[in-house]
């Protein structure tokens, strides 16, 4: 798997998952955010050969096709699999909030 | 939507759904398909600015980065979203085979 | 029941050359078609690497094996073969088949690896 585990221990040139830390108020210009200061949201990148952790038939058709005619501008892109949530606190005039917000960390990647 | 309907008729350089017709024979060499000669698989490109049909929070946060941060080289990628079937014809020895290809046709794409 | 058998692997000196051979055995590969055909090498740490692929009537090779390898296929027998030429330290690696079948959609199956080694 495309994951956090291999990708992170490895040189790996092709589609992987990469660390990518964003301070809330340096990155983003977020200062309602009051924990945590940043996080790691990490991304997807590296080209897609063929059989790379293809998603659906079209993927592997397009590596295939990409392979075999290296000319070509198409070819799959490597993007999040699996991510997970982020629990935040900030605050609503003094009244402190917790929320957990879905999709924020990337956790692995695919071939789409 | 970034849909066939849409994308076919405009010249947008964002993220779209671009047409790619296949040659089953000259582009995969393919000689078992027998039916039909080839078809459009499409594909999906273009660059992905911040909320352009942003796929999940983390798309959105890491379009936003990207925008605030330009030297940044991490950013969504425009992918598929919608993806119909392809039927086709083969034969096994003399006996013909129909067969349905799921997820073969892409219809419109996403930032992801 | 469906296999993919390996063989031709071991030994060599820099220079030197192997051949290698895999069969698909097993009534899938009768009864549905085969669209590709593929040799994958991988070395520790690494993901498999596509060496060379081979359709019908098209091919292609990695870079770095280009003019050394050629990829071969006996459809009769559903066998495929990489010849391998001067062949250099750097292509030590478990050399993996790969048949990809049409059923229910693009289907991939992995042979168990055959170790090649170059070395003097």
């Known amino acids: 798997a495309l994951d956090t585990n291999y990708c992170f221990r490895n040189l790996e040139e092709n589609c992987c998952v990469r660390p990518l830390y964003i301070d809330f108020r340096q990155d983003l210009g977020w200062k309602w955010v009051h924990e945590p200061k940043g996080y790691y949201a990490n991304f997807c990148s590296g080209p897609c050969p063929y059989l790379r952790s293809a998603d659906t038939t079209h993927s592997t058709v397009l590596g295939l096709y990409n392979t075999l005619n290296p000319e070509a501008s198409a070819s799959p892109c490597c993007v999040p699999q699996d991510l997970e949530p982020l629990t935040i606190l900030y605050y609503v005039g003094r009244t402190p909030k917790v929320e957990q917000l879905s999709n924020m960390v990337v956790k692995s990647c695919k071939c789409s | 939507a970034l849909d066939t309907n849409y994308c076919f008729r405009n010249l947008e350089e964002n993220c779209c759904v671009r047409p790619l017709y296949i040659d089953f024979r000259q582009d995969l060499g393919w000689k078992w398909v027998h039916e039909p000669k080839g078809y459009y698989a499409n594909f999906c490109s273009g660059p992905c600015p911040y909320l352009r049909s942003a796929d999940t929070t983390h798309s959105t946060v890491l379009g936003l980065y990207n925008t605030l941060n330009p030297e940044a080289s991490a950013s969504p990628c425009c992918v598929p979203q919608d993806l119909e079937p392809l039927t086709i014809l083969y034969y096994v020895g003399r006996t013909p085979k129909v067969e349905q290809l799921s997820n073969m046709v892409v219809k419109s794409c996403k930032c992801s | 029941q469906l296999q993919l058998v390996e063989s031709g692997g071991g030994l060599v000196q820099p220079g030197g050359s192997l051949r290698l051979s895999c069969t698909a055995s097993g009534s899938t590969f009768e009864i549905y078609p085969i669209y590709a055909m593929a040799w994958f090498r991988q070395t520790p740490g690494k993901q498999r690497e596509l060496v060379a692929l081979t359709t019908d009537v098209k091919t292609n090779y990695a870079d770095s094996v280009k003019g050394r390898f050629t990829i071969s296929r006996d459809n009769a027998k559903n066998t495929v073969y990489l010849q391998m030429n001067m062949l250099q330290p750097e292509d030590t690696a478990v050399y993996v088949c790969?048949?990809?079948?049409?059923?229910?959609?693009?289907?991939?199956?992995w042979g168990q690896g055959t170790q090649v080694t170059v070395s003097s």
């Open positions: 790969n048949v990809g079948v049409v059923r229910g959609g693009l289907q991939n199956y």
